[in-house]
């Protein structure tokens, strides 16, 4: 058996239930619920060995020192006494369940298996106020002398008006010296009315209702107070005071007139002498309510909700504004307005005005601006603005399926918020436009040995100075694509704390320096890059995140990323730009070369012919030609192989200058950017 804590419900089962119960077993489970509750027990399943008088195996239920029955068998068994769905109820908060089994479960020599029982119990409120005398049960509690009030888990006593509950919390004694009535209406009577009132009373019945109400008194029949034919009320008297002023003294059998006290405070004083058997008095008091003037609006935009024909004390009205207007009280903006009719017949606050909603100055759009399509500078309800991006360097981010006409259009709403149909309160984003140089490089001439770049030819070009010169390309407005080996060169130790100096926006090194370096927030090197493997440039790709976004312009624009393999077609011409070595001298200006994508097999053969051990993998491509005297050179590392996409007229970074750089001596090897696009996007997304 399990100890049953004082819970409000639970279950009791035979041991091992629903498996057969053991022989030679007896235990008592004490089910206890909190004081003030009774226990109700019902069997859900019952399967015990049947016997005459339940002598062998049985469940005995008892409570309040009484047995509630002894049970065995199962539904439908000819022998035994199953409990069925009977509800067992205790009077107190305890119930005992004794389960007894004998030495065997046998029937005609066959061993039988009985499952036992499953019972549920619950705490049920004990109504201590219900009369118990009928059932002949002894009441553990003394009864209330006057009134009994049951609540879940207990009870309490109270007394009729004019009596006081004594210390024993059950008995009552006459005490009417300070009876207070605060309800808006009710009945008041002398003690024991309409039976004779007790002697020697000094009763004071006070009626106190809210100001704004006036009390009316109406006496009922019978009215009967001891009096004398010659002397006015010498024995017992009922005196009535309103606002402290005596408005009458009554006795005899003549009912007083209906009284309008014009007051919210009335006292009834009832004095009796030591004798008499008059029946007393009873009155009904009611209240009437004061009225307030009809509310009137101060402007055409104010609305009084559900206007009533009249308003009395405690009534209220709610004022709102027409759409696009807001409530103003003095200089204060209100979210709501309620006026309450006061006890003196005035409204507790003055009528507000309604003023048009103001959305305030529209938010500034980074890399863009806005113009008013309604009156310039007016930011009130129904005003409209159009956000736009600084083109051609930025373009507004569009949602799939959004209407062109609604793009960037924001309206001042009735809520006082600038809102767009699609984006809601969010302002648009101006996204960098990639691969659209304002001054693209001329592609017609064939250049041998490279050439000086003009401003705006390669606006994505980044000049890095980390372990010496290097290059990179701008992606978006805060990312730089470069080679991993510019950050972690092969001949250096793994722990490199070189300063990361990055310059953008010019073709001249000196001018770049003047423009100042861009601090780096984060460096992300591809996990496949191995600094310690000299001949393996696998994963030679890295991203630098700038601390601050750059402002794009004609000399500073990002390059696009490739989206298909056609960018690596044999013979496709691309451009490599950089500030690297040129004819064994460090360049002061950005230079570029135009190179064809080479045949991977030819590059492989060329490498082997030179007895080089370098890894040339699927994640690389080669460009140039052994016979061409043009190639990238030291200092160009990390720069990109840029190809113009004829379909979109956009420039795409298909490669990163990686290795095999011999300065016009054979093929150059590039990281194949297409294979790393997913990694690049993931890295860039993580920070967005």
């Amino acid at each position: 058996s399990i100890p049953i804590p004082q819970k409000l419900f639970g279950e009791v089962t035979s041991p091992l239930f629903p498996k057969p119960y053991p022989n030679n077993f007896e235990t008592t489970t004490v089910i206890t619920v909190p004081t003030g509750y009774r226990v109700k027990l019902v069997f859900q399943q019952f399967d015990l060995e049947p016997s005459e008088g339940c002598f062998y195996d049985y469940v005995k239920i008892s409570a309040d020192k009484k047995s509630l029955g002894r049970f065995c068998g199962q539904l439908g068994s000819p022998l035994g006494n199953p409990p069925g769905k009977k509800e067992f109820m205790s009077q107190g908060n305890k119930m005992l369940l004794t389960f007894h089994t004998d030495f065997s479960n046998e029937e005609n020599g066959t061993i039988m298996f009985y499952k036992g029982f499953l019972a549920y119990y619950q705490a049920v409120d004990l109504d201590e106020c219900a009369s118990r005398s009928k059932s002949g049960e002894e009441d553990p509690q003394p009864q209330c002398q006057h009134l009994c009030h049951n609540y879940v888990g207990g009870y309490f006593c109270s007394c009729r008006p004019g009596y006081e509950l004594q210390e024993d919390t059950h008995s009552c004694q006459a005490e009417c010296s300070s009876e207070l009535y605060t309800e808006a209406s009710g009945y008041i009577s002398s003690l024991e009315y309409p039976r004779s009132y007790p002697p020697d009373l000094r009763c004071n019945y006070s009626i106190r209702v809210e100001r704004g109400l006036t009390l009316h008194l109406k006496f009922l029949e019978p009215f009967d107070i001891d009096d004398h034919q010659q002397v006015h009320c010498p024995y017992d008297q009922l005196q009535i005071y309103a606002n402290g002023k005596n408005i009458g003294e009554f006795c005899g059998k003549q009912r007083p007139p209906d009284l309008d006290t014009s007051s919210n405070a009335v006292d009834l004083l009832f004095f009796t002498d030591e004798s008499g058997d008059s029946r007393g008095w009873k009155l009904r008091y009611t209240t009437e309510i004061i009225k307030c003037p009809q509310p009137k609006t101060l402007d055409e935009f104010t609305i009084i909700q559900n206007l009533q024909p009249q308003y009395q004390f405690r009534d209220y009205f709610i004022a709102t504004c027409k759409q696009g207007y807001q409530l103003i009280e003095g200089n204060q903006v209100l979210h709501s307005f309620t006026a309450v009719c006061q006890d003196d017949g005035t409204w507790h606050r003055a009528m507000p005005r309604c003023k048009i909603k103001d959305c305030g100055q529209p938010r500034n759009l980074p890399n863009g601006d806005f113009r008013y399509t309604t009156t310039m500078g007016v930011n009130t309800y129904k005003a409209r603005i159009q956000y736009y991006c600084h083109e051609p360097y930025y373009k507004m981010q569009t949602r799939a399926g959004s209407r062109e006409s609604e793009q960037g259009v924001y309206t001042c709403t009735a809520q006082g918020i600038w809102k767009n149909e699609q984006k809601g309160e969010k302002i648009p984003r101006c996204l960098p436009v990639c691969g659209k140089p304002v001054n693209p490089v001329e592609q017609r001439q064939r250049i041998i040995g490279g050439q000086k770049a003009k401003m705006g030819n390669f606006p994505w070009q980044v000049f890095t100075n980390i372990h010496g010169r290097g290059g990179g390309a701008l992606l978006g407005d805060r990312w730089i694509l470069t080679a991993a080996h510019t950050l972690y060169p092969k001949e250096h130790e793994a722990q490199s704390n070189a300063s990361l100096d990055v310059f953008l926006g010019h073709t001249n090194v000196e001018e770049l320096m003047k423009l100042g370096n861009h601090p780096i927030r984060r460096v992300s090197v591809h996990p496949d890059y191995r600094q310690d493997e000299s001949y393996n440039f696998e994963g030679d790709i890295a991203l630098l995140e700038l601390e601050n976004s750059v402002t794009l312009g004609p000399n500073l624009l990002p390059i696009c990323l490739p989206d298909n393999d056609t960018f690596y077609d044999l013979g496709l011409m691309g451009y490599v730009s950089g500030f690297g070595v040129m004819e064994e001298k460090i360049a002061h200006d950005l230079r570029f070369v135009r190179l064809p994508v080479a045949n991977p097999q030819a590059c492989e053969n060329w490498l082997r012919g030179k007895n080089r051990m370098d890894v040339f993998s699927q994640n690389m491509f080669c460009a140039g030609h052994p016979s061409l005297k043009q190639d990238a050179c030291q200092g160009d590392s990390g720069g990109v192989f840029a190809v113009r996409d004829p379909n979109t007229d956009r420039w795409v970074a298909t490669g990163i200058v990686s290795w095999g750089i011999g300065c016009s001596r054979g093929y150059g090897f590039y990281t194949k950017v297409l294979n790393y696009v997913d990694w690049i996007k993931k890295e860039m997304e993580e920070e967005d």
């Epitope: 058996s1 100890p3 041991p15 030679n24 007896e26 235990t27 008592t28 020192k65 305890k94």
Partner: antibody
Framework: QEQLKESGGGLVTPGGTLTLTCTAS????????MSWVRQAPGKGLDWIGI?????SAYYATWAKGRFTISKTSTTVDLKITSPTTEDTATYFC??????????WGPGTLVTVSS | AQVLTQTPFSVSAAVGGTVTINCQAS??????LAWYQQKPGQPPKLLIY???DLASGVPSRFKGSGSGKQFTLTISGVQCDDAATYFC?????????????FGGGTKVEIK
């Protein structure tokens, strides 16, 4: 034959601790509620408490805090904490069956003396 | 608190006679009462349970009766072996723990 036997009695000094043990033969202790009763020399029977098969113990009001009933699969123990000379008595264990106690052990005498 | 009062305190009977022992409960206990016999130096022995049911191996000269508050143990055809102290006990031990469940005892002497 169903039998009970108490052990662990003897002389104990006031304020000490003593544990009495009840063992059964012929039936399993884990199948019945077990009770402890004591009898001072020449006096009547005093019920101390009972433990049911689930391990819930119930005590006479006077015994609460002074006595602890516990059980294992083979024994029922009565721990007497800080005994006084008034606790000198023969202590019986009994099996509760049909709201009565049957069988009883022969008892074990506990003498509290300094 | 539930109290069991046994009367008489002691009784003397002749062999072959009848002894009647009373047990009165301060509150109704239904038929939940047992009777025991205890001889000096021995533990109590169950005679009657549930007010009137004879325990296994107990001679039929022992008879229990009563319910509610008033109970009686009758020994008819008293024998020498019946000299002992007899105790009554109520079975409501789980819900009247504020009192002793045993009566004070009645000593029976055989003349």
């Amino acid at each position: 034959q169903e039998q009970l036997k108490e052990s662990g009695g003897g002389l104990v000094t006031p304020g000490g601790t003593l544990t009495l043990t009840c063992t059964a033969s012929g039936f399993s202790l884990s199948s019945y509620d077990m009770s402890w009763v004591r009898q001072a020399p020449g006096k009547g029977l005093d019920w101390i408490g009972i433990i049911n098969t689930g391990g819930s113990a119930y005590y006479a009001t006077w015994a609460k805090g002074r006595f602890t009933i516990s059980k294992t699969s083979t024994t029922v123990d009565l721990k007497i904490t800080s005994p006084t000379t008034e606790d000198t008595a023969t202590y019986f264990c009994g099996r509760k069956i049909n709201d009565a106690f049957d069988p009883w052990g022969p008892g074990t005498l506990v003498t509290v003396s300094s | 608190a539930q109290v069991l009062t046994q009367t008489p305190f002691s009784v003397s009977a002749a062999v072959g006679g009848t002894v009647t022992i009373n047990c009165q409960a301060s509150e109704s206990i239904s038929s939940n009462l047992a009777w025991y016999q205890q001889k000096p130096g021995q533990p109590p022995k169950l005679l009657i349970y549930d007010a009137s049911d004879l325990a296994s191996g107990v001679p039929s000269r022992f008879k229990g009766s009563g319910s509610g508050k008033q109970f009686t143990l009758t020994i008819s055809g008293v024998q020498c072996d019946d000299a002992a102290t007899y105790f009554c006990q109520h079975g409501w031990i789980y819900d009247t723990i504020d009192s002793n469940c045993f009566g004070g005892g009645t000593k029976v002497e055989i003349k």
